[in-house]
């Protein structure tokens, strides 16, 4: 199942998974003056079976001075805190990487990729934070998020993860996201915990569509 | 016939531009035709090929509403008219209830 | 991308095989809907054989490559609608023309 949401926006931090889980898509993406091969995919998708995991389709990208007779597709987009910047993109995959059953590795680049990198995660899927530089970590627990599901809906656990400017204080004045709080303590898959953080209410509400109808007659 | 209509689809529940958004209709007693989606998050359209021309798709994020517009109406765009969240390989998981035009003279 | 059989009468309670067939392979980019009279298709299966949120076990979604088949293991009285195959391998999106699933 997909999370639908993103990963929790951690102020100056950057996340990044070290691995993807079995379907994890991303999508092809090309850059500025460049398009996406005529019925080239859509997506990358992490597939696999018991033994080995890797990524299904290529992404290919061409000049966009070639133009066709339709317009050529582009892939949707994750909101800007969902995408994963070139300096991201480095694989940065612990040794034991490979070795991770029912995942897939960061995919190598493409020709003329996008600068940045727009991922659909899964449940179960993993994802690390560390501050940008210029910043330190102050750490109440672990600076990781996991897409979960509980009640039917998909949510993400918030990391415990500060990061303050090398010359700030380590004294807080108590500005912490209130968000961070059903968090700090181990919660059971059972139970329901509802609160008023936008997130929460997100995650909560059925996604709908509800259609209407506007004529004009023409002049 | 000759008239302009304009079909809304209001979005709930998620982060809007997070997903494409498809428009999919079907004529009396038809199946389903893709008619293509827009990016919601630039407001990039794609038309499938016969959509061409007349077919015009618009999003506005801040009220999380995709848009429609059909000028110049015959009467064989008769049809129910829905829009469909796209999430790509995992389908289209959540459909507008639909909107019917009928065009008569 | 073809889907058979149109028309598909059977008997509450029995099962029911529906299939689709694309001209050309597409892994597992396959998603299938269930459109019950007035009103809007419902997403089923996707991945060819992964279920949606909430869609009863008796629906069931198999194939790879260019065949795949949709099975309805015991139909109830509301799971007599039409049913279409969608490839989502990539745009422009295609459905199968649709099997109506008829009571006997």
């Known amino acids: 199942e997909l999370c639908d949401d993103d990963p929790p926006e951690i102020p100056h931090a950057t996340f990044k998974a070290m691995a993807y889980k079995e379907g994890t898509m991303l999508n092809c993406e090309c850059k500025r003056g460049f398009r996406r091969i005529k019925s080239g995919s859509l997506y990358m998708l992490c597939t696999g079976n018991s033994s080995h995991s890797s990524w299904d389709n290529q992404c290919q990208c061409t000049s966009s001075a070639t133009r066709n007779t339709t317009k050529q597709v582009t892939p949707q987009p994750e909101e800007q805190k969902e995408r994963k910047t070139t300096e991201m993109q480095s694989p940065m995959q612990p040794v034991d990487q490979a070795s991770l059953p029912g995942h897939c590795r960061e995919p190598p680049p493409w020709e003329n990729e996008a600068t940045e990198r727009i991922y659909h995660f899964v449940v179960g899927q993993m994802v690390y934070y560390q501050c940008v530089q210029g910043y330190r970590a102050l750490h109440r627990g672990p600076a990781e998020s996991v897409c979960k599901m509980t009640h039917g809906k998909t949510r993400w656990t918030q990391p415990q993860l500060i990061c303050t400017g090398e010359m700030e204080t380590s004294q807080f004045p108590g500005e912490e996201k209130p968000q961070a709080s059903p968090e700090g303590r181990p919660e059971s898959e059972t139970s329901c915990l509802v609160t008023t953080t936008d997130f929460q209410i997100q995650t909560e509400m059925a996604a709908t569509m509800e259609t209407s109808i506007f004529t004009t007659e023409y002049q | 016939p000759g008239a302009s209509v304009k079909v809304s689809c209001k979005a709930s529940?998620?982060?809007?531009?997070?997903?494409?958004m498809n428009w999919v209709r079907q004529a009396p007693g038809q199946g389903l035709e893709w008619m293509g989606g827009i990016n919601t998050n630039t407001g990039d359209p794609t038309y499938a090929q016969g959509s061409t021309g007349r077919f015009v798709f618009s999003s506005d994020t801040s009220v999380s509403t995709a848009y429609l517009q059909i000028s110049s109406l015959k009467p064989e765009d008769t049809a129910v008219y829905y829009c469909?969240?796209?999430?790509?390989?995992?389908?289209?998981?959540?459909w507008g209830q639909g909107t019917t035009v009928t065009v008569s003279s | 991308w073809t889907q058979s059989p149109d028309t598909l009468s059977v008997s509450p309670g029995d099962g029911a095989t529906l299939s689709c067939r694309a001209s050309e392979g597409i892994r597992t980019s396959v998603a299938w809907y269930q459109q019950r009279p007035g009103q809007a298709p419902r997403l089923l299966i996707y991945g060819a054989s992964t279920r949606a949120a909430g869609v009863p076990a008796r629906f069931s979604g198999s194939g790879s490559g260019t065949e795949f088949t949709l099975t309805i293991s015991s139909l109830q009285s509301d799971d007599f609608a039409v049913y279409y195959c969608?490839?989502?391998?990539?745009?422009?999106?295609?459905f199968g023309q649709g099997t109506k699933a008829e009571i006997k």
């Open positions: 529940g998620y982060t809007f531009t997070t997903y494409a």
């Open positions: 969608q490839q989502t391998h990539t745009w422009p999106w295609t």
């Open positions: 469909a969240r796209d999430r790509f390989h995992y389908g289209m998981d959540v």
